[in-house]
């Protein structure tokens, strides 16, 4: 058993049929010594008396808010949550496996630049009685500070018969050094509580591996005289790290016909312009990637050819 | 060339070669997503690699003030990785394919380190890996980790040379 926060405790249980459970001793936070009784949740049934209460925690029915009273007055509370371990593996019932980039990916994180700011998100099908708490650090043995905001519901989607809820959180490394080569990964820890079930999820990454630039901005076409060719130009996204002579991007320019089956013409360039042939009803798209480190490509920025 | 006395390197040549190094480092070990082997036992060989850290002067401001600190750090790293790529981690079994980019990568690391420091000039305190022979079973994981680490190192070096070529070239 360990303390998650003041008056909230997590009991770690090996979860299998007829498991013996864990013996837990609760102590009433009071100078009083006698006349103390204990109840669980809203029930008025007295579970025991005295300053301490010893219980055998085996299942969710044994978890909940234990309260000690004296003469009708509440003295203190202890909320017990359960953390299940099945076959040596902690349960992951609350969050959905996103399966990208690999199985057992519950948290996904992205950064738009090297400033030390990043966003993580996760999915669940649970709509109520759900709370999240996020902590982060750079490294684990001698952790350096990362500040995370509160997790918020950022999207709702319908997936077949189910509703899916996306939560996200923004974090910022306290003393980021954008130009340095990271040697210690960022660690992100999410505590999830659904009713009386506790679970924790972690992710470990280097900012460089989760970089995904915003799409190029101000994408423009300039027809070239007496030619089917056009000059496409664009700019670095505002959110990308500066100076651009140091934090350089590379770009992919694609000409795509109306039909998905039509052959795509692709050009790769380090410049912020390119000359391409604009076919009728086609569109031109440009995306960006860090020039020197193969992290994710941005989403496409597109303009029609006409 | 960045001679220890403090004259400028051939920024443009360094830029071109460092960008080639980035391409080679990724073709030597292409990755889908960021396959994570960091948990798989931290071998000393990859713990001891020289990293370009915050105080090494490799940021735009530091380069403007005095690029020598940063260039020395990059040189140390290039020599270190060049030694690693020549060690039995890469030359032993399981053998690399004859057309593996590791050979080219190895040669390019040497090429860039020589551009930074011609024969006869020496920056002091070289960090050289002390390599005990590796076991074949360790090598695939060590190669993975070294190449991952090298990708990060050469990315920073390439940014330094690109910025230098754009803003510090005579």
């Amino acid at each position: 058993i360990w303390e998650l926060k003041k008056d909230v405790y997590v009991v770690e249980l090996d979860w299998y049929p007829d498991a013996p459970g864990e013996m837990v001793v609760l102590t009433c936070d009071t100078p009083e010594e006698d006349g103390i009784t204990w109840t669980l949740d809203q029930s008025s049934e007295v579970l025991g008396s005295g300053k301490t209460l010893t219980i055998q925690v085996k299942e969710f029915g044994d978890a909940g808010q234990y309260t000690c009273h004296k003469g009708g007055e509440v003295l203190s509370h202890s909320l017990l949550l359960l953390h299940k371990k099945e076959d040596g593996i902690w349960s992951t019932d609350i969050l959905k496996d996103q399966k990208e980039p690999k199985n057992k990916t519950f948290l996904r994180c992205e950064a738009k630049n090297y400033s030390g700011r990043f966003t993580c998100w996760w999915l669940t099908t649970i709509s109520t009685d759900l709370t999240f708490s996020v902590k982060s650090s750079r490294g684990s043995s001698d952790p350096q500070g990362v500040t995370c905001g509160a997790a918020t519901l950022s999207a709702e989607r319908v997936r077949g018969d189910n509703k899916e809820y996306e939560y996200s959180v923004e974090c910022q490394e306290d003393s980021a050094c954008p130009a340095a080569e990271e040697s210690l990964p960022i660690e992100v820890m999410v505590d999830a509580v659904h009713k009386l079930k506790y679970e924790n999820y972690t992710s470990s990454f280097f900012i460089r591996d989760i970089i995904k630039p915003d799409p190029p901005k101000n994408l423009q076409l300039k027809p070239l005289k007496n030619s089917r060719q056009v000059e496409v130009s664009w700019e670095y996204p505002d959110t990308w790290s500066t100076p651009h002579s140091y934090f350089s991007l590379t770009f992919c320019v694609q000409v795509q016909g109306k039909s998905k089956r039509e052959k795509k013409d692709r050009v790769f360039t380090d410049k912020t312009s390119a000359t391409v042939i604009c076919r009728k009803n086609a569109s031109i798209s440009v995306r960006a990637q860090d020039r020197y480190y193969s992290s994710s490509w941005s989403e496409w920025a597109s303009v029609p050819c006409s | 060339r960045a001679v220890p006395g403090g004259s400028s390197p051939a920024w443009t040549q360094c830029q071109q070669l460092s960008q080639k190094l980035c391409t080679l480092a990724w073709s030597a070990h292409p990755l889908v997503g960021h396959m994570d082997l960091r948990e798989e036992g931290d071998e000393e060989t990859t713990n001891d690699v020289p990293h370009i850290q915050c105080g090494d002067g490799c940021d735009p401001q530091g380069l403007r003030d005095n690029s020598q600190f940063c260039l020395q750090r990059i040189h140390q790293g290039l020599i270190f990785y060049e030694k690693l790529l020549g060690s039995d981690i890469f030359t032993g079994e399981p053998s690399l394919l004859p057309d593996s980019p590791v050979g080219q990568l190895h040669a390019s690391l040497l090429g860039l380190s020589q551009l930074l420091q011609p024969e006869g000039h020496h920056w002091e305190t070289q960090q050289i890996p002390s390599l005990s022979p590796s076991q074949p079973w360790q090598r695939l994981l060590l190669r993975f980790k070294i190449l991952r680490s090298l990708q990060a190192f050469v990315a920073v070096a390439a940014r330094v040379f690109a910025h230098g070529a754009a803003t510090l070239s005579p």
Epitope: - | G86, S87, D88, T91, S95, Q135, W137
Partner: antibody
């Protein structure tokens, strides 16, 4: 073509030393390690050690430590195996071999130790 | 040290026969195993590396299988030039060790 050519047969007295050479051609000598293996008459194969010609790093079989020295000369793409304090049971064919999974072996050098 | 136990030590077979030689490692070696063929007075010739990969130029009647501790070399249809001694060898860790050999003779 890619090959390993070893030096000729040797007859040695007990207590003396022998140095066998192995010249590599047709490939970049420093991109692979070089093993030495021996085979006594009518017996199986026994690994002695290897060298990484790039950095002269060696790894020896404990059984031969202190008696075997493997060296390499990058300028001539040649590996050497020297065995000292010879005894009659060192009579064998000695082979050099590039990385096991590349299938490149020398033709073998017969060393006879006899008084 | 990891020991390699090869069996049988010798076998007699006829041309066209299917021949199987086994090799057992005293510890787990994943697929770090080679098979060699050796003829009298000649250097060993690599047949299989990585337990299952056929060396370039080796006839497809030779195949390797196994992983971990148990490995097999199979000659699907024995040819006259296949009468020789066969060795397995592990290259998982040093010291690299060879099996005792299997002599394939004409019945």
């Amino acid at each position: 073509q890619v090959q390993l050519v070893q030096s000729g047969a040797e007859v040695k007295k007990p207590g003396s030393s022998v140095k066998v050479s192995c010249k590599a051609s047709g490939y970049k000598f420093t991109r692979y390690v070089m093993h030495w293996v021996r085979q006594a008459p009518g017996q199986g194969l026994e690994w002695m050690g290897y060298i990484n010609p790039y950095n002269d790093g060696t790894n020896y079989n404990e059984k031969f430590k202190g008696r075997v020295t493997i060296t390499a000369d990058k300028s001539t793409s040649t590996a050497y195996m020297e065995l000292s304090s010879l005894r009659s049971e060192d009579t064998a064919v000695y082979y050099c071999a590039r990385n096991w999974d590349t299938g490149l072996w020398g033709q073998g050098t017969t060393v006879t130790v006899s008084s | 040290d990891i020991q390699m136990t090869q069996s049988p030590s010798s076998l007699s077979a006829s041309v066209g026969d299917r021949v199987t030689i086994t090799c057992k490692a005293s510890d787990h070696i994943l697929k770090f195993l080679t098979w060699y063929q050796q003829k009298p007075g000649k250097a060993p010739k690599l047949l299989i590396y990585g337990a299952t990969s056929l060396e370039t130029g080796v006839p497809s009647r030779f195949s390797g299988s196994g992983s971990g501790t148990d490995f097999t070399l199979t000659i699907s249809s024995l040819q006259p030039e296949d009468f020789a001694t066969y060795y397995c060898q592990m290259y998982w860790s040093t010291p690299f060790t060879f099996g005792g050999g299997t002599k394939v003779e004409i019945k």
